[in-house]
């Protein structure tokens, strides 16, 4: 997973005497916005699938009014980057379309008018994690300058963002069961270990050590059900103590969707479902035909030869909306069993299973001890997908093949000397100390200072100190 980022540096007239007239005037002030459409560069269906890798619409630029008699300068641009998140691997070779749109802010009936000022396209090779690449392209009398890059979202790394890696903890080798992240031999493959205690049913993680809750659950370990019955309004940030949703202002208040679009809340913001003939973040783009490529994510555009006739987008599997702009969250159905992490790859669902489980939906519970032998009389113990050997005295290691040195861990406290014995170890305590590990001081009058009850034992439980 990662993000493609596009930075527009300038949009203005190309050099030379034939500079275009400004797209804005005193009578018709306007502002610009940009649309980027990405697709895998070498896919055969690329032409028919305009935005299979994703698309993004910029914010509106500042309002610009032409100064009479002055040549068109570079036009004021929207702030920030255009970001296109990608869930799957970065393809390395990609195709792009960048469109410059003009929003006229005159006294049009029915809201602002839209027109496409310029469109540039190209195919490039780009490794994720690399530096910014800059491009300059002409479109008619206009010149567009932009930079782009692709970066991975941690813990994904590599030129395609397909490997989960972390820096090596030990200088010489990776931890048990972990392979080096070739070709980055100084990194190790990271096991996807959620925060300890994270609910396997209601929590999941996309990075080691985190615990993210499925809808309806809250708390640091996703063990607290969200109860809305005692709340004033089913909205707002969750209260950690009650698990109750505290009321707050809703992103759909006042309906930000124009042109009859309907608003629905999302975890971060809101989403507009636009009527046919409109698209954009707030359904503000209109007068669109199939020639404008309004269908995102590989949607097939039908009809709409002129601005007055509607078009229809036939969406590919995994996408919906009048412009195929919404990814169907098929993971919300929780298809992965036994705490597996659901990944919607667009073309397919994938379950990343927790250790000890397998199958397309993590439905198979693996027998960790099957075919595993513990040497030297050790017995196999199943545990969370990783078999473990409980070794007989005097042996250790993963399969009990190593002869254990019980004194290696220096178990005798307060200067006691350790002796290996057939039954384990024996501590010879220094003067003034006693106990199996020489852990208790002996009082000068000869009475021992044994605790009333060691931690974890109730008074009256059998206590063996020696």
């Amino acid at each position: 997973a990662g993000v493609f980022e596009l930075q527009i540096h300038s949009f203005g007239p190309g050099p030379g005497p034939g500079a275009p007239r400004s797209p804005c005037s005193a009578r018709l002030p306007c502002r610009l916005f940009f649309r980027v459409c990405l697709k895998p560069g070498l896919s055969e269906e690329a032409a028919e699938s305009p935005c299979a890798l994703g698309a993004a619409l910029s914010a509106r630029g500042p309002v610009y009014t032409e100064q009479p008699g002055a040549p068109a300068p570079d036009l004021p641009l929207p702030d920030g980057l255009l970001q296109v998140p990608f869930r799957d691997a970065w393809p390395g070779t990609f195709s792009f379309i960048i469109e410059t749109w003009r929003e006229e802010l005159g006294d049009q009936i029915g809201g602002p008018a839209w027109s496409l000022l310029a469109r540039v396209a190209g195919r490039r090779r780009l490794a994720a994690g690399g530096p910014w690449a800059r491009d300059i392209q002409r479109a008619g009398a206009w010149e567009l300058r932009f930079s782009y890059r692709a970066r991975c979202e941690p813990p994904a790394v590599g030129t395609a963002c397909t490997r989960l890696c972390r820096p090596r903890s030990a200088p010489s080798r990776c931890g048990p069961g972990l392979r080096p992240c070739a070709p980055l031999e100084d990194e190790c493959e990271a096991p996807l270990v959620c925060r300890a205690g994270c609910s396997p049913e209601h929590g999941f993680c996309e990075q080691p050590g985190e615990c993210r809750c499925l809808e309806g659950w809250t708390g640091p370990l996703c063990t607290v059900p969200v109860s809305t019955s005692s709340c004033l309004s089913p909205r707002g940030p969750s209260s950690a103590t009650t698990g109750c949703l505290v009321p707050g202002p809703g992103p759909c208040d006042g309906n930000p969707c124009a042109n009859g679009g309907s608003c629905s809340e999302t975890p971060r913001s809101f989403e507009c479902t636009c009527p046919r003939g409109f698209y954009g973040l707030r359904c503000e783009v209109s007068g669109v035909t199939c020639a404008d490529g309004p269908c995102f994510n590989g949607g097939l555009c039908v009809g709409g030869a002129d601005p007055d006739s509607a078009y229809i987008c036939h969406c590919p599997p995994g996408f919906q909306g009048s412009n195929c702009e919404k990814r169907v969250d098929r993971c919300s159905l929780q298809p992965c069993r036994n705490g597996g992490l659901c990944l919607d790859l667009g073309h397919a669902l994938r379950c990343r299973c927790r250790a000890g489980f397998a199958g397309p939906r993590c439905e198979h519970d693996l027998d960790d001890c099957a075919g595993r032998a513990c040497a030297n009389g050790g017995t196999c113990v199943e545990g969370g997908g990783a078999h473990r050997c409980s070794c007989a005295l005097g042996f250790g290691g993963r399969d009990c093949r190593e002869r254990a040195d019980p004194c290696a861990a220096r178990p005798c406290a307060h200067g006691g000397r350790c002796y290996a014995h057939f039954s384990g170890l024996v501590c010879a305590c220094a003067p003034g100390y006693m106990g199996a590990r020489c852990e208790f001081p002996v009082h000068p009058d000869g009475a021992s200072a044994l605790p009333a009850a060691p931690p974890g034992l109730r008074p009256g439980d059998p206590q063996r100190y020696l």
């Epitope: 396209a121 190209g122 490039r124 300059i136």
Partner: antibody
């Protein structure tokens, strides 16, 4: 007036290296990429690669990777192309050309390289 | 790499005649095509970009058209100063690639 002034003709022996320069004037040097193009004995044109003087990033046609190295000196608004391990196949006219990816609007006058023992 | 096939390799035309040069790409290049003119002993000069946009200062008798993989450049009324070699160049994908050229002579 935009101008790209290239260095003079070069005669080199096989195995040697050569560095051709292209001095830009009349525009903001970091505002456009600098492309390099090879033309062998008056025949077709072949794109070698380009360099972005702003970020310093460069891109090459695969066959010229290891053969050509593109650099810039922003302080003097000059682009350079170094060709190494020269053979007779490298004998050609080399052009620098200002532009973006879909236009080369100004070209240098060309530098003739002759590789001969 | 995208291959550009240019035709004809050479042709001769009389003053006032209409000349058409064509260029075929090995795959769809989405209008990303430029045309250059190179006169004998000179550097190439940009005529047309984005398949049909005329560069500043280029006479209006030059025009470009086409889409997909097929593109052409037309000189509406041949003039003596149009004697040159013409190259097409695809700008859709890196590496940028040129056609082999068309040598246009005065008849």
């Amino acid at each position: 007036e935009v101008q790209l002034q290239q260095s003079g003709p070069e005669l080199e022996k096989p195995g040697a290296s050569v560095k051709i320069s292209c001095k830009a004037s009349g525009y903001s040097f970091t505002g456009y990429n600098m492309n390099w193009v090879k033309q062998s004995n008056g025949k077709s044109l072949e794109w070698i690669g380009n360099i972005d003087p702003y970020y310093g990033g460069s891109s090459y046609k695969q066959k010229f990777e290891g053969k050509a190295t593109l650099t810039v000196d922003k302080s003097s608004s000059t682009a350079y192309m170094q060709l190494k391990s020269l053979t007779s196949e490298d004998s050609a006219v080399y052009y620098c050309a200002r532009g973006g990816s879909n236009f080369f609007d100004y070209w240098g006058q060309g530098t003739t390289l002759t590789v001969s023992s | 790499d995208i291959q550009m096939t240019q035709s004809p390799a050479s042709l001769a035309a009389s003053v006032g005649e209409t000349v058409t040069i064509t260029c075929r790409a090995s795959e769809n290049i989405y209008y990303s095509l430029a045309w250059y003119q190179q006169k004998q002993g000179k550097s190439p000069q940009l005529l047309i970009y984005n398949a049909n946009s005329l560069e500043d200062g280029v006479p209006s008798r030059f025009s470009g058209s086409g889409s997909g993989t097929q593109y052409s450049m037309k000189i509406n009324s041949m003039q003596p100063e149009d004697t040159a070699t013409y190259f097409c160049k695809q700008t859709y994908d890196v590496p940028l690639t040129f056609g082999a050229g068309t040598k246009l002579e005065l008849k």
